[in-house]
C-alpha cells in the first residue's frame, strides 16, 4: 500500500505541532493536537503516554485506564467522575490528564 505525502498509515497517530496564536489569552492546561488514522471501531487515545488508536468503547465508557495510558511500571487511576486519569510513578509523583 502506497501512502501519499502527509497521509497516515491506518492505525497510527502523529503529534501535530501548531503555531500558537499569541493574541489569545494564555491557558495553563497543557494541550496537544494529535492526528490519527484509525481502523473502524477505534478512536484517538493514549497508550504508554503516546498518542494511539484505541477501542472506541473505552472512550464511550470513560474507562480511560483500559487504554493503558501510563508508562510501564506506573499505576493508573480514574479521576472522580471519570473526567480523566492519573499516572502514579514508582516514586510517588502523580501526573494528571483531564479529558475535555
Amino acid at each position: 500500500q502506497f501512502l501519499k505525502e502527509g497521509q497516515l498509515a491506518a492505525g497510527t497517530c502523529e503529534i501535530v505541532t501548531l503555531d500558537r496564536d499569541s493574541s489569545q489569552p494564555r491557558r495553563t492546561i497543557a494541550r496537544q493536537t494529535v492526528k490519527c488514522s484509525c481502523f473502524p471501531g477505534q478512536i484517538a487515545g493514549t497508550t504508554r503516554a503516546r498518542p494511539a488508536c484505541v477501542d472506541a468503547r473505552i472512550i464511550k465508557t470513560k474507562q480511560w485506564c483500559d487504554m493503558l495510558p501510563c508508562l510501564e511500571g506506573e499505576g493508573c487511576d480514574l479521576l472522580i467522575n471519570r473526567s480523566g486519569w492519573t499516572c502514579t510513578q514508582p516514586g510517588g509523583r502523580i501526573k494528571t490528564t483531564t479529558v475535555s
Epitope: 497543557a30 508508562l71 502514579t88 509523583r93 502523580i94
Partner: antibody
Framework: QEQLVESGGRLVTPGTTLTLTCTVS????????VSWVRQAPGKGLEWIGY??????PHYASWAKGRFTISKTSSTTVDLKMTSLTTEDTATYFC?????????WGPGTLVTVSS | ELDLTQTPSSVSAAVGGTVTINCQAS????????LAWYQQKPGQPPKLLIY???TLASGVSSRFKGSGSGTQFTLTISDVQCDDAATYYC?????????????FGGGTELEIL
Amino acid sequence: QEQLVESGGRLVTPGTTLTLTCTVSGFSLSSYGVSWVRQAPGKGLEWIGYIANNYNPHYASWAKGRFTISKTSSTTVDLKMTSLTTEDTATYFCARDNYGMDPWGPGTLVTVSS
Amino acid sequence: ELDLTQTPSSVSAAVGGTVTINCQASQSVYNNKNLAWYQQKPGQPPKLLIYAASTLASGVSSRFKGSGSGTQFTLTISDVQCDDAATYYCQGEFSCSSADCNAFGGGTELEIL
C-alpha cells in the same frame, strides 16, 4: 482560570517557626499536586517539596526535617518552616506541579533578620 | 548529588538573532524527557515555556524550541525579541524514590543588544 496565591510571608527573627499558605482556585487539589519553590534575593530557583493529590509529600534532601508540606483544606496547601535562619530569606512560590509547574502564584516574601 | 548545570550563565543577543541555552543533568531525568524550561522576568513568577523536553506550553511562541533527552537538553530561542530579555531556567523531574523529585538549573540571563 487556574490560580494560586501565597500568603503568610513576613519579617521574623532567627529560630522562628512560620507557616505559609497556598490558596488555589480554578482546579482541584484532589486532581493535581503542588510544589513549593523559593528564590533568595538575586538568586536562582530552589525546589523545596511537592505534595501529590493523594496527600503524599516529597521533599528536597536539604529541606527534610525542617519543612513540612500539608493539605489543610480542599483549596489550601501549607508550608511549615521551623528554626528559620537568615539563609531562609527568600520569596516563596507555590505552583501546580503536573506536566511542568504551571501556573505559579505571585510569591510571598519571608525575611529572617535579627 | 542531583545537579542540573546550565550554560552559559549569561548571554547577549541582537534582535532577530538566535540563542542556545544548554542544560545538563547529573543523572537521567524521569522517562528521559521530563525536563521543563521557564522564563522569569524581574518581580514576576516563572512562566512555563516547554515541558516534556520539547512540548510547547499553551500560548507560548513557537520561536522557543526545546530538544534533548536523558541528561542533555537545549532551549533555542530564534528571532529574538526585546521582550525575551529575562532569566531562563531548566527544571528536571526525577524519580522521587531514588532522589529529589525536582531540581532547577542555575539560570541563564539573556540580555538583548
